[in-house]
């Protein structure tokens, strides 16, 4: 994908420096598996520079290829509490809106562990809303160094 | 954060290409939980381009948002060796100096596993020193494909 | 590494926007531990922009430092299926060709878990072919949100 002459002459920021790192705000009500996120310097080290939050879900504002990363740690976790995973507790990151673009991007199960962490490159479009669904009955830690979710625009 | 006109006209490198990938040098004495890192082409595939090492700890030389990543594998590891520890072996990456900015950025426990790996975006400032603390009595592998720690400047 | 005056004046793309995200195509025959990858919009959300595939292995076309990331999930997995293996199922990412540059870059064992995920920064050169070797008798999931492999050029 060639950059247009106009793009070449714009400041780098206009090519897309969109980036966000979020911390867990809360979980949804019992029938809602989504995690609800928050970001901003007043909250600690989380931030939103380009993307925005819509009712705790991350919305993309610029087309491009993004690096999406996430870490989720279970709040109470030990060898005894991990045995409480039935159909193993699973975390899925996906595009949940618009419905026409709904897809799972990243999926991990906790199995015997207490933390999942991963990352991937994926094309995202302006207006895509990312949801992070945690299935099961165990709660994610709200400690900001244990549970976080972020995206980084890497190229058009 | 807008780029200044001067920044727009400077070579890209001046915007910050700071990057480092380190390999484990050694662990600290018994009361020091820190891992000590080393980097440089003579050592293999590790390198420092911008950040620097201060007594085995990584010091940031340019303000910005960084992607911090780490993988640590325990040297002698099985489900029994990790599960026999009451306080699970834990790895924490944080700013340890200056003291006024001390904070834990990333924390993972090994639980039933032998490797932890994660990454996150975080704002770092010139002079921040990152420490990686491994608590517990198990030793990390020094194999360069099993244990490594790196940072990448991604935007101002 | 200073950028040359010519580089400073070329469009950004010429500095290297090389990037790829691949999905699993198939595993090799019994004596071949390599995973075979595929990429392209017709397949889903995978893509190759710069790097290329050579018989299912990823070949680099531009020198630079790359962020390499991978996630592999075992297809049929439980704590019993992973723990019953004497030699833990292991995933290694390395340069497999040219032979003179052969090296393991990233290695993880599944132990009690069903997914491994990690990432690292590493220098790669034009012509380097990356292989991902999965040892053991367990099969990787071909679900595109569970198993993927990618590289991103980050600086010269």
């Amino acid at each position: 994908q060639r950059l247009s002459r106009a793009q070449q002459q714009l400041p780098l920021e206009s090519l897309g420096w969109d980036i966000a790192e979020l911390q867990l705000n809360h979980t949804g009500p019992q029938q809602d598996p989504r995690l609800y996120w928050q970001g901003g310097p007043a909250l600690g080290r989380s931030f939103l520079r380009g993307p925005e939050l819509d009712k705790g879900q991350l919305r993309i504002r610029r087309d491009g290829i993004y690096m999406v990363h996430i870490q989720v740690t279970l709040a109470i976790c030990s060898s005894t509490s991990t045995s409480r995973h039935h159909h193993p507790t699973t975390l899925a990151v996906g595009i949940c809106s618009p419905a026409s673009r709904s897809i799972s991007l990243l999926r991990l199960s906790f199995h015997q562990g207490c933390t999942i962490a991963s990352q991937r490159l994926t094309p995202l479009a302006r207006g895509d809303t990312l949801c992070t669904n945690l299935t099961g009955t165990l709660l994610p830690s709200r400690n900001t160094d244990e549970t976080f979710f972020g995206v980084q625009w890497v190229r058009p | 954060q807008r780029l200044s006109r001067a920044q727009q006209q400077l070579p890209l490198e001046s915007l910050g290409w700071d990057i480092a990938e380190l390999q484990l040098n050694h662990t600290g004495p018994q009361q020091d939980p820190r891992l000590y890192w080393q980097g440089g082409p003579a050592l293999g595939r590790s390198f420092l381009r911008g950040p620097e090492l201060d007594k085995g700890q990584l010091r940031i030389r340019r303000d910005g948002i960084y992607m911090v990543h780490i993988q640590v594998t325990l040297a002698i590891c099985s489900s029994t060796s990790t599960s026999r520890h009451h306080h699970p072996t834990t790895l924490a990456v944080g700013i340890c100096s200056p003291a006024s900015r001390s904070i834990s950025l990333l924390r993972l426990s090994f639980h039933q596993g032998c490797t932890i790996a994660s990454q996150r975006l975080t704002p770092l400032a010139r002079g921040d020193t990152l420490c990686t603390n491994l608590t517990g009595t198990l030793l990390p592998s020094r194999n360069t494909d099993e244990t490594f720690f790196g940072v990448q400047w991604v935007r101002p | 590494q200073r950028l040359s005056r010519a580089q400073q004046q070329l469009p950004l793309e010429s500095l290297g926007w090389d990037i790829a995200e691949l999905q699993l195509n198939h595993t090799g025959p019994q004596q071949d531990p390599r995973l075979y990858w595929q990429g392209g919009p017709a397949l889903g959300r995978s893509f190759l922009r710069g790097p290329e595939l050579d018989k299912g292995q990823l070949r680099i076309r531009r020198d630079g430092i790359y962020m390499v990331h991978i996630q592999v999930t075992l297809a049929i997995c439980s704590s019993t299926s992973t723990s019953r293996h004497h030699h833990p199922t292991t995933l290694a990412v390395g340069i497999c060709s040219p032979a003179s540059r052969s090296i393991s870059l990233l290695r993880l064992s599944f132990h009690q878990g069903c997914t491994i995920a990690s990432q690292r920064l590493t220098p790669l050169a034009r012509g380097d072919t990356l292989c991902t070797n999965l040892t053991g008798t367990l099969l990787p999931s071909r679900n595109t949100d569970e198993t993927f492999f990618g590289v991103q050029w980050v600086r010269p």
Epitope: L24, Q30, T73, A75, I76, S78, T80, S81, S83, R84, H85, H86, H87, G136, T137, L138, L139, S141, R142, N143, E146 | - | S78, S79
Partner: antibody, heavy 118, light 111 residues
Framework: QVQLVQSGAEVKKPGASVKVSCKAS????????MNWVRQAPGQGLKWMGW????????TYADAFKGRVTMTRDTSISTAYMELSRLRSDDTAVYYC???????????WGQGTTVTVSS | DIVMTQSPDSLAVSLGERATINCRAS??????????MHWYQQKPGQPPKLLIY???NLESGVPDRFSGSGSGTDFTLTISSLQAEDVAVYYC?????????FGQGTKVEIK
């Protein structure tokens, strides 16, 4: 709707064993664990342990280890609690309670009275 | 084991008045942004019923006159306006670590 139906009252002699069943309906049995809680006459509640109904792995309270066995039969969505070497102070109502993970025990069986008497 | 101590052991309150039950844990049951404390109601001849989970969340179908508060080691169950059907024994229970333990119970009666 979610229901946990337990087996009927039992009278046992000291030294004998008792096996109480808990049949679940109205939800996917293997998605939730099952706790066992007992209540002696006029006393409070005491947690005995629980079973992961998916894997069959039990976790027992120390006070009952060696005497209690928790099992399940997924084909009939039923959990079992067997207590051996019964003593008179094991006389109690035994409850099964669905484990809703970190959210507590959200549904309870009606209770099974076990009387240990010579 | 974490010991849960409720106070008072029994409580007599007039209809329409507030009832407050306290529960103290021998060590903190809060971690990672949550308090792993739950409250149950048990009426005579019936099994316990979950009222409040995670210290302050009302279980579905429970009247909103019930509320929970607290963190760390000290927790409170409040019935804002006691009704006749609230006569029961109330138990606190933690799920911070194995073994889960219950308080000894607080009997609520009408004055």
């Amino acid at each position: 709707q979610v229901q946990l139906v337990q087996s009927g009252a039992e009278v046992k002699k000291p030294g004998a064993s008792v096996k109480v069943s808990c049949k679940a309906s109205g939800y996917t049995f293997t998605n939730y664990g099952m706790n066992w809680v007992r209540q002696a006459p006029g006393q409070g509640l005491k947690w005995m342990g629980w079973i992961n109904t998916y894997t069959g792995e039990p976790t027992y309270a120390d006070a009952f280890k060696g005497r209690v066995t928790m099992t399940r039969d997924t084909s009939i969505s039923t959990a079992y609690m067997e207590l051996s070497r019964l003593r008179s102070d094991d006389t109690a109502v035994y409850y099964c309670a669905r484990d809703y993970g970190d959210y507590g025990m959200d549904y309870w069986g009606q209770g099974t009275t076990v009387t240990v008497s010579s | 084991d974490i010991v849960m101590t409720q106070s008072p052991d029994s409580l007599a309150v007039s209809l329409g008045e507030r009832a407050t039950i306290n529960c103290r844990a021998s060590k903190s049951v809060s971690t990672s942004g949550y308090s792993f404390m739950h409250w149950y109601q048990q009426k005579p001849g019936q099994p316990p019923k979950l009222l409040i989970y995670l210290a302050s969340n009302l279980e579905s179908g429970v009247p909103d006159r019930f509320s929970g508060s607290g963190s760390g080691t000290d927790f409170t169950l409040t019935i804002s306006s006691l009704q006749a059907e609230d006569v029961a024994v109330y138990y606190c229970q933690h799920s911070r670590e194995v073994p889960w333990t219950f308080g000894q119970g607080t009997k609520v009666e009408i004055k």
